[in-house]
C-alpha cells in the first residue's frame, strides 16, 4: 500500500509531503491516490479534511503546501486516500520537519603547514542556505562536516558546530581531500542534504619550505 | 498549578537598557513557546517577540527587532527579555504569556492561556 | 503581516444584552484566532481558542464563530461581570497580531 516517505519543510514557511506509489505484485489496483490534510487547531477531532493544495510543484507523488497553507503554530495530520478509504496517516507540526536545503558557496584556506611539511591545517567556510532566515533567528542551524581522501570511501565527521566556518587539522599534504557540510534545525533529528562537494588540494611541500638566509 | 510572573521593570532613561524576567512554575518553558506582548497607557495589545527555547527559535515584532532579545535559561525555568536602545514608545506594561500548541497526546488550540500579571517600563528622561 | 481589523471600537449595552464583535483578518488565517477578555489593571484572559473552541472555565453565553476571515466574538446575555475590554487575535503568520479591542460598557 501507498505510505509517507517524507514531510520537509526547507524553511518553516512551506513544506511538502511525499509518499511511494510502488504497485505490488498481486495487490488489487488501488485506484488514484489523494492526499487530505486537516489543521488541528482543537482538541476535538471534528475537523474538515480538504484535499491537497497543489500535486504538481514537488514532483510526483506529492504535495506541496505553499506558505498561504502552512503555520508554524497549528500541528497538522494528513492522511492518504484511495477509492475512499485510508491507506495511511499522520501528524505533525512544521517545526518537526525542518529539513534545510543544503549550505552553499563553501570555500577554504590554508591556515598553517607541520613544520615537517607532511601536514597542513585550513579553514573552511559556507553560507546558509539562502532560504534559511538566520538573522532574525527564525531558524537556528547546526552544521555537521565531513571529509575524506577523494580515493577513501570512508567520511570522516566532525562534531556539529553552530557557525558557519571550522578548522580542518592534519590534513596530508600531496594528498586531495573532498568536503561536504549538511545542516539541520537545532534540537530536530533531520539534517539535510549535503551541500555540493568541495575538493582541497594542499600545494605541494616544496611551496610551503623558505630557503633561510645565510650570513 | 501554572504560573507566570514577570520582574524587572522600572523606570529607565531612552536609549538605556531593562531585562525583564518571566519566572515560569507549573510547567517546563522548554515545551511551549513563551511570548512576550505589551500594552502602552490607554492602548490595546502588542504582540512582541517569541522564544521556542527547545528548537531555539526567535522572532520578533518589527518596532523592536534589532532592540530587543528573546532567551530562556532552560534550567531556571525562565524566560527573559533583553530590551536595549529603548525608546518612549516602548512605555507599556510587558506581560509573558504560554502557547502550548499540543503535548502529552492532547491537542490544544490556538491562543494564550497562561499570562503573567505584567510589569510596567517607563522610558521617561 | 496580517492584520485584524476589530469592530466596534467601543459599545455600550445593558445587561441581558446580546454582544457581537467582529474581526475580519486582511488575509486567510484558518481558525487561528483566539478571543480575550481584560479588565483594567489586570491580564487579559483567554476566552474563546480556535476560532469558537471555548476554553476551560469560561461561561457558555461566551461563544466563537468563523465564517471565511471574519470571526465573531458573541456575548449571548450580558452579565455585570462582562463590562471589560475584548481582544481578538491570530496566530497564524509568522508575526502575531491582535485587534485593537472593543471597550464593552454599561450603557
Known amino acids: 500500500e501507498p505510505k509517507f516517505t517524507k514531510c520537509r519543510s526547507p524553511e518553516r514557511e512551506t513544506f511538502s509531503c511525499h509518499w511511494t506509489d510502488e504497485v505490488h505484485h498481486g495487490t488489487k489496483n488501488l485506484g488514484p491516490i489523494q492526499l487530505f490534510y486537516t489543521r488541528r487547531n482543537t482538541q476535538e477531532w471534528t475537523q474538515e479534511w480538504k484535499e491537497c493544495p497543489d500535486y504538481v510543484s514537488a514532483g510526483e507523488n506529492s504535495c506541496y503546501f505553499n506558505s498561504s497553507f502552512t503555520s508554524i503554530w497549528i500541528p497538522y495530520c494528513i492522511k492518504l486516500t484511495s477509492n475512499g478509504g485510508t491507506v495511511d496517516e499522520k501528524c505533525f507540526s512544521v517545526d518537526e520537519i525542518v529539513q534545510p536545503d543544503p549550505p552553499i558557496a563553501l570555500n577554504w584556506t590554508l591556515l598553517n603547514v607541520s613544520l615537517t611539511g607532511i601536514h597542513a591545517d585550513i579553514q573552511v567556510r559556507w553560507e546558509a542556505p539562502r532560504n534559511a532566515d538566520i538573522q532574525k533567528g527564525w531558524m537556528v542551524l547546526e552544521y555537521e562536516l565531513q571529509y575524506k581522501e577523494v580515493n577513501e570511501t570512508k567520511w570522516k565527521m566532525m562534531d556539529p558546530i553552530l557557525t558557519t566556518s571550522v578548522p580542518v587539522y592534519s590534513l596530508k599534504v600531496d594528498k586531495e581531500y573532498e568536503v561536504r557540510v549538511r545542516s539541520k534545525q537545532r534540537n530536530s533529528g533531520n539534517y539535510g542534504e549535503f551541500s555540493e562537494v568541495l575538493y582541497v588540494t594542499l600545494p605541494q611541500m616544496s611551496q610551503f619550505t623558505c630557503e633561510e638566509d645565510f650570513y | 498549578e501554572v504560573q507566570l510572573v514577570e520582574s524587572g521593570g522600572g523606570l529607565v532613561q531612552p536609549g538605556g537598557s531593562l531585562r525583564l524576567s518571566c519566572a515560569a512554575s507549573?510547567?517546563?518553558?522548554?515545551?511551549?513557546?513563551i511570548h512576550w506582548v505589551r500594552q502602552a497607557p490607554g492602548k490595546g495589545l502588542e504582540w512582541v517577540a517569541y522564544?521556542?527555547?527547545?528548537?531555539?527559535?526567535?522572532s520578533y515584532a518589527d518596532s523592536v527587532k534589532g532592540r530587543f532579545t528573546i532567551s530562556a535559561d532552560t534550567s531556571k525555568n525562565t524566560a527573559y527579555l533583553q530590551m536595549n536602545s529603548l525608546r518612549a514608545e516602548d512605555t507599556a506594561v510587558y506581560y509573558c504569556?504560554?502557547?502550548?500548541?499540543?503535548?502529552?497526546?492532547?491537542?490544544f488550540g490556538v491562543g494564550f492561556d497562561y499570562w503573567g500579571q505584567g510589569t510596567l517600563v517607563t522610558v521617561s528622561s | 503581516d496580517i492584520q485584524m481589523t476589530q469592530s466596534p471600537s467601543s459599545l455600550s449595552a445593558s445587561v441581558g444584552d446580546r454582544v457581537t464583535i467582529t474581526c475580519r483578518a486582511s488575509?486567510?488565517?484558518?481558525?487561528?484566532v483566539a478571543w480575550y477578555q481584560q479588565k483594567p489593571g489586570k491580564a487579559p484572559k483567554l476566552l474563546i481558542y480556535?476560532?469558537?473552541s471555548l476554553y476551560s472555565g469560561v461561561p457558555s453565553r461566551f461563544s466563537g464563530s468563523r465564517s471565511g476571515t471574519d470571526f465573531t466574538l458573541t456575548i449571548s446575555s450580558l452579565q455585570p461581570e462582562d463590562f471589560a475590554t475584548y481582544y481578538c487575535?491570530?496566530?497564524?503568520?509568522?508575526?502575531?497580531?491582535f485587534g485593537q479591542g472593543t471597550k464593552v460598557e454599561i450603557k
Open positions: 480556535s476560532a469558537s
Open positions: 487575535q491570530q496566530m497564524w503568520g509568522s508575526l502575531i497580531t
Open positions: 504569556a504560554r502557547y502550548q500548541s499540543y503535548g502529552g497526546g492532547y491537542w
Open positions: 522564544i521556542s527555547s527547545y528548537y531555539g527559535y526567535t
Open positions: 507549573g510547567f517546563n518553558v522548554s515545551s511551549s513557546s
Open positions: 488575509q486567510s488565517v484558518s481558525s487561528a
